[in-house]
């Protein structure tokens, strides 16, 4: 006879999986809030800053009620991938001024990467359709000046904060429906 069968594979509780994703998202939200505050102290923002290459905010708080789990996770993953790419770009091309935000910017990048892996795992555990491979994104142009890099940093951290805030609310709401 062959080897004894292994223990039956326990299907993870989706609520527990979502809990752990919420915790990671909330932790990253706090990191982003604190880093954005540090940036504002070092380089005060003169008004709101936008970056055309950033994703538009996925959902207003008022529209959360209509959310469905696959759509939320797919959209969140796509948006966070874009923010990860922008943070990497900022660290690489942001200029010497933004070096004062290290190692925090590096920590943020690592945690963003970890959250993306957690979302991927959650989608596979919940047997959700896997999104197609990401098409290669066009390279981001380097900032035109040191202040261009700082303005981009304000836009990236501000947008990431809004996205993560939306994500925490959305994930908590979805958890009540599981």
């Amino acid at each position: 006879p062959g080897p004894p069968p292994g223990p039956p594979r326990v299907s993870p509780d989706p609520r527990a999986e979502l809990d752990s994703t919420v915790l990671l998202t909330r932790s990253l939200l706090a990191d982003t809030r604190q880093l954005a505050a540090q940036l504002r102290d070092k380089f005060p923002a003169d008004g709101d800053h936008n970056l055309d290459s950033l994703p538009t905010l996925a959902m207003s708080a008022g529209a959360l009620g209509a959310l469905q789990l696959p759509g939320v996770l797919t959209r969140l993953r796509a948006d966070l991938l874009s923010y990860l790419r922008h943070v990497q770009w900022l660290r690489r091309a942001g200029g010497s001024s933004l070096k004062t935000l290290e190692p925090e910017l590096g920590t943020l990048q690592a945690r963003l990467d970890r959250l993306l892996r957690r979302l991927q795992l959650l989608m596979s555990r919940l047997a959700l359709p896997q999104p197609p491979p990401d098409p290669p994104a066009p390279p981001l142009a380097p900032p035109s000046s040191a202040w261009g890099g700082i303005r981009a940093a304000h836009a990236i951290l501000g947008g990431l904060h809004l996205t993560l805030d939306w994500a925490v609310r959305g994930l908590l709401l979805l958890k009540t429906r599981l």
Partner: antibody, heavy 120, light 108 residues
Amino acid sequence: EVQLVESGGGLVQPGGSLRLSCAASGFTFSSFGMHWVRQAPGKGLEWVAYITPGSNTIYYADTVKGRFTISRDNAKNSLYLQMNSLRAEDTAVYYCAREYSSYDEGFAYWGQGTLVTVSS
Amino acid sequence: EIVLTQSPATLSLSPGERATLSCSVSDLIPSQYLHWYQQKPGQAPRLLIYGASNLASGIPARFSGSGSGTDFTLTISSLEPEDFAVYYCQQGVDVPFTFGQGTKLEIK
């Protein structure tokens, strides 16, 4: 040794104003975010306001928003709380507190507190 | 707003006994943002534990913290006379920063 000393408390009538100060020493004041926390007589702790080292990010509790203003003068190693339109429910001991680091690790250092009494 | 609920409101124990204080959080929070304070009458609060389980500087090893998600615990392994005080938990992950209502630890 880190030291925080509050002053400026006292008796004020409802609708009146008061300005609290917190003198800091024993650390590089300009490197740390600062908080005000209050405690009504016989009650628990309530966070009031927070200001980052460079004063560019400020948060308030909803109960004081629009009435209280937190500020700081890094050259004087001082933190302030301007309190306007005071109400009876603002009666409390007001503490200034320093964050442990820029990434939240709690209110690591506290002053001894200054009592504000709002009464007619 | 994240609400913290402490239990019991009052805990009556004798020196040498073990004390277990609970803090229940209305929302999931990462453990690194949950802190515990001790306050004695007429004194300012003192940070005991930060990040749910890290002992603050100068705090005796009989104090320990644990927990994750929504349920956190402060344990005093063997009570000393100076440990009788009010204990508060606090979250720093979300603005407004909030405290629990406190647990009064009194001598039996």
